[in-house]
Interface confidence: low
């Protein structure tokens, strides 16, 4: 007859570092001591007739146990497979790139460290909930990569690594594992520079409006600008809309500046850079600054008209030209009564790097001399019809300007110049026009005849 | 056996940058992680930061991060460490060493580099 | 950052003497995976770090007996159980649970 030697569990499977509680018995009646071979750690919990109860402790790894007994002086043999089982110690994605160009391939890296059977470890990378690859953990530690194509919808997605250690065929469910998140950043930065809009010339002390623009930029918000005039940098206000970013800044040009000079537009992201250049002449154009020796001249004196402006400015006055670039347009003349309010032009002409630039200026003379009046202006003798409104044309000039007054010779009665009045017999006779200021006195004597009305 | 080989030493001036290199034998690169440490005249030891040379990643200590800058040459063997903008008190020797992902500690350690800042 | 402070500072000592230096850290150095990432090293005159002994009490290969480390959570001791002349230098605690890695401030054997 043949005896069995029965090892129970049969195949158990246990977490690692677990204890297993192990029975070997068998119904040989004449059977010697039961053994139980095994590397593991062991101890004889109980035994009896044809049976013996061990415990296995610290279970670390896969094992098979073997019991034996010699029964009638043959041996009998039985055996149990342990399967033992754990969790990864470490599941971890491997840094993403800081930032990743849309339409280029980035790798996802897990490393799984630990995680026992391997046969039943599962390596899932993952994009939000959504598998990208799914492969077995082989090596220790295990890496799994899988190639992804970057998006502008990854753009701050979270992408994982998930470890799932199957031992629902034990009857002991899924374990699953998932390492921290990170978050991908991806990029569009065109290869065209950016549109930069700056004067050609700017003026010392001016200011004047600088524009940057790159468009096809994702995610715009993330992008650095910087504009610069030579090393000076602007203040830039940068303003986003959908896929373009616009910076604008206020370029004011300093003294120390002068001179050729580049504004530059930097836009940065993702770690790559665009840039734009613009030639820019900072200049200085000072004047034309005209002056009078004598703002207000007497009659007969001399006068000095002068006009000046910046170095390499060329300046005209009154059709004259300067000498040359950088030196004053001068002219001398004797006042008259002619020259008052006289205007003086001064042109001045600064040329920037091909370009001429034009500012003029102008100054008044005044020139003090006594009343007079004009004769042709003035009627020295008037005919006139009674009862018939009339004005009395007198025009008085001089500087200051002269009061004019016509009194009739023989009494106080005046006449109103160069307003309308109606005019009768009384206003016939001699009259004295009078003109007058600080300067002196004119006088002209003015007749005037009026002819009665004639009733038939 | 395991050797870790590190460039001789260094005089630079404020401003500058300095690289030092770390040159592993005896073991698989790829297998451990490099770590670099200075240690200033008299002082004690100042963790900087680690590179795995498998993943190609790194971890800084807060103190240096945009200052330091380590990478791993995996077809020479060859760990770097770079640090910009020298001061007169990043004068020390700076160490390379190498851990295993367990134990978790620093096991065989380079000679040292002397790196001096001086104007 | 896990702030480690050894103590004594310096540890005069006789050959053939029993020697201890303690480690304290600010805050616990329990791994979430349970293990406790705190090491010894020795630095002799001269020379480079040297491991002495790794995660608390494990003793690093080609370490004599007569070093041994323990504790737990926040307070650490190594141990020298006879000290040689070769055991001279300065000895550093450190830990690795935590980024960034920290330093004790180093503790120096020297004959009395």
């Known amino acids: 007859q043949e005896f069995l030697l029965r090892v129970e569990p049969q195949n158990p499977v246990l977490s690692a570092g677990g204890s297993l509680f192990v029975n070997c018995s068998t119904d040989c009646p004449s059977s010697e001591k039961i053994a139980l071979e095994t590397s593991l750690s062991k101890e004889l919990v109980a035994s009896g007739m044809g049976w013996a109860a061990f415990n296995l402790s610290n279970v670390t790894g896969n094992s098979r146990i073997l019991c034996s007994v010699y029964c009638n002086g043959s041996q009998i043999t039985g055996s149990s497979n342990i399967t033992v089982y754990g969790l990864p110690e470490r599941v971890e994605l491997a840094p993403l790139p800081p930032w990743q160009p849309v339409g280029q391939n980035f790798t996802l890296r897990c490393q799984v460290e630990g995680g026992s059977p391997r046969t039943s470890l599962t390596v899932v990378l993952l994009r939000w909930e959504e598998e990208l690859s799914r492969q077995p953990a082989v090596e220790e530690p295990a890496e799994v990569t899988a190639t992804v194509l970057a998006s502008r919808d990854d753009h701050g997605a979270p992408f994982s690594c998930r470890t799932e250690l199957d031992m629902q065929p034990q009857g002991l469910g899924l374990f699953v594992n998932t390492s921290a998140p990170r978050q991908l950043r991806t990029f569009v930065l065109p290869v065209t520079p950016p549109r930069l809009v700056a004067p050609r010339f700017l003026e010392v002390e001016t200011s004047w409006p600088v524009d940057c623009t790159l468009d096809g930029l994702f995610p715009a918000s993330e992008a650095q600008v910087y504009l610069a005039l030579g090393d000076q940098m602007l203040n830039a206000t940068v303003m986003n809309h959908g896929d373009t970013l616009t910076a604008t800044a206020t370029a004011t040009a300093r003294a120390d500046q002068e001179g050729a000079r580049e504004i530059v537009c930097n836009v940065t992201l993702g770690g790559e850079r665009r840039e734009a250049r613009e030639n820019l002449t900072v200049f200085s154009f000072l004047g034309p600054i005209v002056n009078l020796s004598e703002p207000t001249a007497h009659e007969g004196s001399t006068v000095t008209v002068s006009c000046m402006a910046g170095a390499r400015v060329q300046v005209t006055l009154d059709g004259v030209p300067a000498a040359a670039p950088g030196q004053t347009a001068q002219l001398q003349l004797n006042a008259t009564e002619s020259d008052d309010g006289r205007s003086f032009f001064c042109s001045a002409t600064l040329e920037v790097d091909g370009e001429f630039l034009h500012r003029n200026s102008s100054v008044q003379l005044r020139v003090l001399y006594g009343p007079k009046i004009d004769r042709a202006t003035c009627p020295q003798h008037l005919k006139w019809k009674d009862k018939t409104r009339h004005v009395l044309q007198c025009q008085a000039r001089g500087n200051p300007y002269p009061e004019l007054r016509c009194l009739k010779e023989g009494s106080s009665r005046e006449v109103p110049v160069g307003i309308p009045f109606f005019v009768n017999v009384t206003h016939n006779g001699t009259y004295q026009c009078q003109a007058s200021s600080s300067r002196g006195k004119y006088t002209l004597v003015v007749v005037m005849d009026i002819e009665a009305f004639s009733s038939h | 056996q395991v050797q870790l080989v590190q460039s001789g030493a260094e005089v630079k001036k404020p401003g500058a940058s300095v690289k030092v290199s770390c040159k592993a034998s005896g073991y698989t690169f790829t297998d451990c992680i490099i770590l670099w440490v200075r240690q200033a005249p008299g002082q004690g030891l100042e963790w900087m930061g680690k590179?795995?040379?498998?993943?190609?990643?790194?971890t800084y200590a807060q103190k240096f991060q945009g200052r330091v800058t380590i990478t791993a040459d995996t077809s020479t063997s060859t760990a770097y460490m770079e640090l910009s903008s020298l001061r007169s008190e990043d004068t020390a020797v700076y160490y390379c060493?190498?851990?295993?992902?367990?134990?978790?500690?620093?096991?065989?350690w380079g000679q040292g580099t002397l790196v001096t800042v001086s104007s | 950052d896990a702030v480690m402070t050894q103590t004594p500072l310096s540890l005069p000592v006789s050959l053939g003497d029993q020697a201890s230096i303690s480690c304290r850290s600010s805050?616990?150095?329990?791994?979430?995976?349970?293990?406790?990432?705190l090491h010894w090293y020795l630095q002799k005159p001269g020379q480079s770090p040297q491991l002495l002994i790794y995660k608390v009490s494990n003793r690093f290969s080609g370490v004599p007996d007569r070093f041994s480390g323990s504790g737990s959570g926040t307070d650490f001791t190594l141990k020298l159980s006879r000290v040689e002349a070769e055991d001279l230098g300065v000895y550093f605690c450190s830990q690795s649970t935590h980024v960034p890695y920290t330093f004790g401030g180093g503790t120096k054997l020297e004959i009395k």
């Open positions: 590179i795995n040379p498998y993943f190609g990643t790194t």
């Open positions: 805050q616990s150095l329990v791994h979430s995976n349970g293990d406790t990432y």
């Open positions: 060493a190498r851990k295993e992902a367990y134990p978790d500690a620093m096991d065989y």
